[in-house]
């Protein structure tokens, strides 16, 4: 049996189980790509508070992240216009696909920073803290980074959590 057919059959078998994981529209895939050199440290790298996603300690400990990765990879290549039949799916990349990967990573990181700014008040640049010493000089940074990041989003204690968060939107009094 051809490798492609084998993978397709394996994916068919798990697609129904892993469907909710795909709702995050490829951010998971980007994260896995971002972190491939780092051993995956979680049972499932998805938000545990979401129903059917994540694995609590009442469930089985075995990890099926490699299957998830395949499913997510398939879904994401399709949604990004790269079809399973195309040479890109075999790992052959041209400049265009490398650029789109870089864009996805940039989008993922921007979203991560946005959420962290809202939840914890993480500033989006070092200049926001006037006391930051010169070790983080402008020359060390990407000159376009400020433009890519947009305006600084300082979170006040009363601000609500982002709508995508599965944590409750309880206002903070502390």
């Amino acid at each position: 049996m051809k490798r492609k057919e084998r993978i397709a059959r394996r994916l068919e078998g798990i697609e129904t189980d892993t469907q909710p994981i795909l709702l995050q529209s490829c951010t998971g895939l980007v994260t896995h790509r971002l972190l491939e050199e780092d051993t995956p440290r979680y049972m499932r790298a998805t938000d545990p508070a979401s129903p059917h996603i994540g694995r609590s300690n009442e469930e089985e400990e075995t990890s099926d992240s490699s299957l998830e990765k395949q499913t997510r990879s398939k879904q994401c290549t399709e949604t990004s216009g790269i079809h399973a039949d195309s040479p890109y799916s075999s790992g052959i990349m041209d400049t265009q696909s490398l650029e789109s990967k870089a864009e996805r990573i940039a989008r993922y990181k921007a979203e991560r920073r946005r959420q962290l700014a809202e939840k914890y008040g993480l500033t989006l640049d070092p200049e926001a803290d006037s006391e930051t010493p010169s070790r983080y000089s402008r020359s060390r940074k990407d000159p376009e980074a400020a433009e890519k990041r947009g305006v600084r989003s300082e979170r006040s204690a009363e601000s609500s959590r982002d709508a995508g968060s599965s944590y409750s939107r309880t206002e903070l009094s502390g």
Epitope: A45, A49, L122, D125, D129, S168, T170, L172
Partner: antibody, heavy 123, light 107 residues
Framework: QVQLQQSGAELVRPGASVTLSCKAS????????MHWVKQTPVHGLEWIGA????????AYNQKFKGKAILTADKSSSTAYMELRSLTSEDSAVYYC????????????????WDTGTTVTVSS | DIVMTQSHKFMSTSVGDRVSITCKAS??????VAWYRQKPGQSPKLLIY???YRYTGVPDRFTGSGSGTDFTFTISSVQAEDLAVYYC?????????FGAGTKLELK
């Protein structure tokens, strides 16, 4: 293997400043925020703040604003914390620690810790 | 700031016992609570995050539960190496805060 390696113990005079370093290895330094945590017998574990190594963006515990300054150097995968105007209250073990990561949602708990640096402030 | 209160500073146990450590948040933190174990002379080690999710490599005798303001960390069968200090931490909002710790010791 993911590792954080901090600088050695420091004995410093009151009023002086000290800079602690934390070198990361085994993962992409810019993909995770780096945090600093203080531990004393009296106050237990206290979160000082965090830095995004890629942008230099920071978040501080208000209690430590002005006391601690966090920076990072991407080229050497090293995070730094400068402690200013030291008093005996600043004598503690200081840990650098990496935040855990999620796809889709991001929460700050700490999955990798170093062994810590002991800072003693004494005249 | 959110205060995390661990009501027991010390808990006595025997090897093989089941033990539960509690932690109470001063306000609703949903399920944003992590648990750490710290042995003497070592750094804390992550055991549980998001209230009930066991960190990779952590034995299944460790479990966590709770939401809102009340959280419980349970060791189903205490081993000698479990004698340590256990801390809860809220990761709901800044500043991140820890409980004062519960020291697990032998009876």
């Amino acid at each position: 293997q993911v590792q954080l390696q901090q600088s050695g113990a420091e004995l410093v005079r009151p009023g002086a400043s000290v800079t602690l370093s934390c070198k990361a290895s085994g993962y992409t330094f810019t993909d995770y925020e780096m945090h600093w945590v203080k531990q004393t017998p009296v106050h237990g574990l206290e979160w000082i703040g965090a830095i995004d190594p890629e942008t230099g963006g920071t978040a501080y515990n208000q209690k430590f604003k002005g006391k601690a300054i966090l920076t990072a150097d991407k080229s050497s995968s090293t995070a730094y914390m400068e402690l200013r105007s030291l008093t005996s209250e600043d004598s503690a073990v200081y840990y650098c620690t990496r935040s855990g990561i999620y796809d889709g949602n991001y929460w700050w708990y700490f999955d990798v810790w170093d062994t810590g640096t002991t800072v003693t402030v004494s005249s | 700031d959110i205060v995390m209160t661990q009501s027991h500073k010390f808990m006595s146990t025997s090897v093989g016992d089941r033990v539960s450590i509690t932690c109470k948040a001063s306000q609703d933190v949903s399920t944003a609570v992590a648990w750490y174990r710290q042995k003497p002379g070592q750094s804390p080690k992550l055991l549980i995050y998001s209230a009930s999710y066991r960190y990779t490599g952590v034995p299944d005798r460790f479990t966590g539960s709770g939401s809102g303001t009340d959280f419980t960390f349970t060791i189903s069968s205490v081993q000698a190496e479990d004698l340590a200090v256990y801390y809860c931490q809220q990761h709901y909002s800044a500043p991140l805060t820890f409980g004062a710790g519960t020291k697990l010791e032998l009876k």
